[in-house]
């Protein structure tokens, strides 16, 4: 149903039935003995989407997910029994839920699962070349998964595998109390965050991990973790959640006398995503749900997109906030949070900060220390007691780029595509929800790049039954979006241009960067094809200018088009 209305009303709202009828969705409805299709790994080179699920790992063809291979990786009956004996649910907990699926090298993936509350990891052979058609479990090589996968399938792991080392934020114990950021695998001793210290991590829920270079020197590379956690006592009145960004240096090998095999460069800062509310009290979106990094020409400065929801049960809302890495770095170079005063409240640390500044990576760029093991004792002592920054990271423009508060759903996932249109580049967001719908939203700059207008292009129901979308990937090569849920997978093209209507005006008014009027129909826009007959106006959506004569066929038709 085509609707040309306010920005918060989708131009196109498509039910699951309409998506099927227009060949706009391909679904994989899961296997009878599996579920939880939550762990995605996109391989554009091989044209595969690897998916970790309950007791299975899948390799889907990106062209059509109906074409797939599968590995069955259940737990032994003995592990299942032990899990059951521990009072866990045989279906929902006493199975192997795959939580980590990463490229290990050119020929293998690394996978970890909950192993029925007994985390386990192994390698998956995928061959040298796509045509090898190899997809098999290395069942002679199992490894302990503690500190890599959680025990409990309800928990997530944020992980990153680089240079043969696995960085993971997860729960490292049966009870789900010992949360930590680990580095395992590789040749070095495993490293983790300080244990039983709520200043470091306070019952966190990890979202994702990313390597972001700090300079042209790879020694300065940092790994950033995104998570949400309980606010530390005194930081907030009452129990509250805070969204966080944490950093660690890739070349952190722990301390020498103190913080041995613990991170010495761990710092965290709060991510703010809020709107001014009545009575001068801001409405905060604190429950970070997902993060997407949009790479720019400068690899040091990707744009961070975050999806947030409210903590309140009374007021349900979702928001998308954008952050710049320069703002993040500014906060990490700012004052540390310190407890002081009669009420032992958090204040900016005013004293002498030891040299080299805690959080700085040991390298030639920022000082003469070759290793964190060489750091002076006062640096280590300070780092141990000051893991948090005082200043929060505010979003670009100090406000969300999109908010939804008057709807019966919440945002869960986000992926973003940078699209070349006739009148410039646009970021198109695909936002997954907890009811199985995907929103397609375009950010349109107004006067300045920082001032954005959000246009909700489409709202698509991609699963038959309402089900939370728990994973999303976008293939720029295939021009397809993939969504995972407890029940299965959905694949959809990034555009449905024909659905906007059969007139130039409707196509133009849609303001979809993927679509343009080609003289006969609203069809996919290819930037390379510089045909004079392509009508498109994303910035203004003005059909009068673009659809009048000038070689453009098609009648001016302002009537809404219904299917």
């Amino acid at each position: 149903n085509y609707q040309n209305g306010k920005n918060n009303v989708p131009r196109l709202k498509l039910s699951y039935k309409e998506m099927l009828e227009s060949n706009s969705v391909i679904t994989f409805n899961g296997l009878a003995n599996s579920s939880s299709y939550h762990t995605f790994l996109l391989d554009e080179e091989r044209s595969r989407l690897y998916v970790g699920a309950k007791d299975h790992i899948f390799s889907f063809n990106l062209v059509n997910i109906k074409d797939f291979q599968k590995i069955v990786w259940p737990v032994s009956y003995t592990r299942r029994d032990e899990c059951k004996w521990a009072g866990k649910d045989i279906q929902k907990e006493c199975a192997n839920f795959i939580k980590v699926l990463k490229a290990y090298n050119q020929t293998h993936l690394y996978a970890c699962g909950t192993g029925a509350f007994h985390p386990i990891c192994t390698y998956i052979e995928i061959g040298h070349h796509p045509e090898d058609n190899i997809f098999k479990l290395e069942d002679s090589h199992f490894e302990n998964g503690r500190g890599k996968s959680p025990y409990d399938p309800k928990l997530l792991t944020a992980s990153l595998l680089i240079d043969g080392e696995l960085y993971s934020g997860t729960a490292a114990d049966f009870m789900g109390r010992d949360f930590a950021i680990f580095r395992t695998l590789g040749h070095h001793h495993p490293i983790r965050t300080e244990q039983h210290d709520s200043r470091w991590l306070n019952d966190p829920r990890f979202i994702s991990a990313h390597l972001i270079p700090e300079s042209d020197n790879p020694e300065d590379d940092k790994v950033y973790f995104f998570f949400r956690e309980n606010a530390i006592d005194g930081e907030h009145t009452g129990k509250a959640t805070h969204a966080r960004i944490g950093q660690i240096c890739k070349n952190d090998f722990g301390g020498h006398r103190s913080l041995v095999n613990k991170w010495t460069t761990f710092l965290k800062a709060r991510l703010i995503c809020s709107v001014p509310g009545p009575n001068g009290i801001d409405t905060h979106f604190d429950e970070l749900q997902d993060v997407f990094l949009m790479n720019s020409k400068d690899p040091k400065n990707p744009i961070v997109y975050g999806v947030f929801t409210t903590s309140s049960n009374i007021f349900k809302g979702s928001a998308v906030c954008m952050y710049s890495m320069s703002d993040v770095r500014r906060v990490f170079l700012g004052p540390y949070a310190h407890r002081d005063g009669p009420n032992y409240q958090w204040v900016p640390y005013q004293g002498r900060v030891p040299y080299p500044r805690p959080g700085t990576c040991p390298s030639k760029t920022f000082g003469g220390f070759d290793s964190t093991k060489d750091l002076p004792d006062d640096v280590i002592t300070f780092a141990r007691s000051h893991p948090a920054m005082y200043n929060p990271v505010f979003p670009i423009n100090n406000r969300p780029i999109m908010i939804k508060t008057d709807v019966n759903y919440q945002f869960t996932q986000i992926v973003v595509d940078r699209v070349d249109a006739e009148d410039g580049q646009y970021d198109v967001m695909f936002i997954g929800t907890d009811v199985g719908t995907v929103l397609k939203v375009v950010s349109i700059p107004k006067e300045t790049w920082h001032d954005l207008e959000e246009v909700l292009l489409e709202e698509m129901t991609v699963f038959r039954e309402p089900t939370p979308i728990s994973a999303m990937e976008l293939s720029t090569k295939q021009h397809q979006l993939y969504a995972g849920s407890p029940a299965g997978l959905a694949q959809l093209p990034l555009q449905r241009c024909a659905a906007y209507g059969r007139a130039c005006a409707e196509c133009c008014l849609a303001r979809d960067p993927y679509c343009a009027w080609d003289g006969a129909a609203c069809s996919r826009y290819f930037p390379a094809a510089k045909a004079r007959t392509r009508a498109q106006d994303i910035r203004n959506g003005d059909p009068l200018t673009h659809c009048s004569d000038g070689g453009i066929e098609g009648r001016m038709d302002h009537h809404h088009h219904h299917h």
Epitope: Y77, T78, R80, D81, E82, K84, A86, F174, M175
Partner: antibody, heavy 116, light 111 residues
């Protein structure tokens, strides 16, 4: 070859305490749940307690709950049973058993005699 | 009083087939795997059957296990004198959150 060797048994007065140990070898101790099972003289087997491979979960039979504590030290490949407030009915041979969905390996047992 | 019920004794002559029963409820045998243990005189118990009917390596195929509903049974065919021992069935009990054993069956090989 899997081996389980119990020690620490002996004669103790009612109300007294005893700590049993079980040294394990021949398998990756830290990968398996472990258990204690006892057998009173001339009687059948009675499960006492079990502990998860990483100590994350512990279970006890009602007859010993609150008095016995199971623990393990994975770095020493050793299982323990701390027995407090012992009663005459706790007199038995105490076996340490490797748990693998069932008790697939047993030690030879250590005798605990509680006298009044 | 054991949660699982076994006959206190059973007997047979060499070469004969003997069956030992084990009766329980839905919270143990009905919904959980049954194991059988053999205890030779003066020794520790040994696992004989696991997961209702599976034999660990080294256990002769003369021993077999089966389960139906809330009852299980152990069959020994081609009885031999060295089979003389106490036999226990066992299973996890979901409602008790503990492992339960039968009272044991003393098998005597006659003649």
């Amino acid at each position: 070859e899997v081996q389980l060797l119990e020690s620490g048994g002996g004669l103790v007065q009612t109300g007294g305490s005893l700590r049993l140990s079980c040294a394990a070898s021949g398998f990756t101790f830290s990968d398996y749940a472990m258990s204690w099972v006892r057998q009173a003289p001339g009687k059948g087997l009675e499960w006492v307690s079990w502990i998860y491979y990483d100590s994350g979960s512990k279970y006890y039979a009602d007859s010993v709950k609150g008095r016995f504590t199971i623990s393990r030290d994975n770095s020493k490949n050793t299982l323990y049973l701390q027995m407090n407030s012992l009663r005459a009915e706790d007199t038995a041979v105490y076996y340490c058993a490797k748990l693998n969905g069932d008790f697939d390996y047993w030690g030879q047992g250590t005798l605990v005699t509680v006298s009044s | 009083q054991s949660v699982l019920t076994q006959p206190p004794s059973a007997s047979g002559t060499p070469g004969q087939r003997v069956t030992i029963s084990c009766s329980g409820s839905s919270s143990n045998i009905g919904n959980n795997d049954v194991s059988w243990y053999q205890q030779l005189p003066g020794t520790a118990p040994k696992l004989l059957i696991y997961a209702d009917s599976h034999r660990p390596s080294g256990v002769p195929d003369r021993f077999s296990g089966s389960k139906s509903g809330t009852s299980a049974s152990l069959a020994i065919s081609g009885l031999r004198s060295e089979d003389e021992a106490d036999y226990y069935c066992g299973a996890w009990d979901s409602s008790l959150s503990g492992y339960v054993f039968g009272g044991g069956t003393k098998l005597t090989v006659l003649g």
